[in-house]
């Protein structure tokens, strides 16, 4: 996990999350998201 310190003084943790596409549809393969501060943003 990468960790970045911003000017606000808060530490924001970035974590890659991987999901299987077939769990949310009919496609195969993996979906890669980025979780920042507890929220998946990509």
């Amino acid at each position: 996990d990468a960790e970045f310190r911003h000017d606000s003084g808060y530490e924001v943790h970035h974590q890659k999350l991987v999901f299987f596409a077939e769990d949310v549809g009919s496609n195969k393969g993996a979906i890669i998201g980025l979780m920042v501060g507890g929220v998946v943003i990509a």
């Epitope: 974590q15 999901f19 299987f20 077939e22 769990d23 949310v24 195969k28």
Partner: nanobody
């Protein structure tokens, strides 16, 4: 929840191969994405590979990509990890885990069932 039991570990020389097996008990096996993690002495448990509920999709850690292959047999309630071109840094206890559908398959917290682990030692 499923109960998991790993086997197939052992001592192998660098460059060698091993096939790990994970036997699952429970009728809900195909509701779970299945993964392998490993834990080297003094280190945390790290993601190795995962296979989707159907077995169609797989995902690997960069460190094992091209060397390890994960598969599953839903008729036998089993998951396998074929490990080729083994390196000393692959030495670890390997754990099989079950993650319910829709959860992130590369993070430990998604897995609610674990086996007891099987030790793989790569050494000459």
């Amino acid at each position: 929840e499923v109960q998991l039991l790993e086997s197939g570990g052992g001592l192998v020389q660098p460059g060698g191969s091993l096939r790990l097996s994970c036997a699952a008990s429970g009728r809900t096996f195909n509701n779970y994405n299945m993964g392998w993690f490993r834990q080297a002495p003094g280190k945390g448990r790290e993601f190795v590979a995962a296979v989707s509920r159907s077995g169609v999709s797989t995902y690997y850690a960069d460190s094992v990509k091209g060397r390890f292959t994960i598969s599953r047999d839903n008729a036998k309630n089993a998951v396998y990890l074929q490990m080729n071109s083994l390196r000393p840094e692959d030495t670890a206890i390997y754990y099989c885990g079950a993650a319910y559908r829709g959860t992130a398959i590369n993070v430990r917290r998604s897995y609610d069932s674990w086996g007891q682990g099987t030790l793989v030692t790569v050494s000459s």
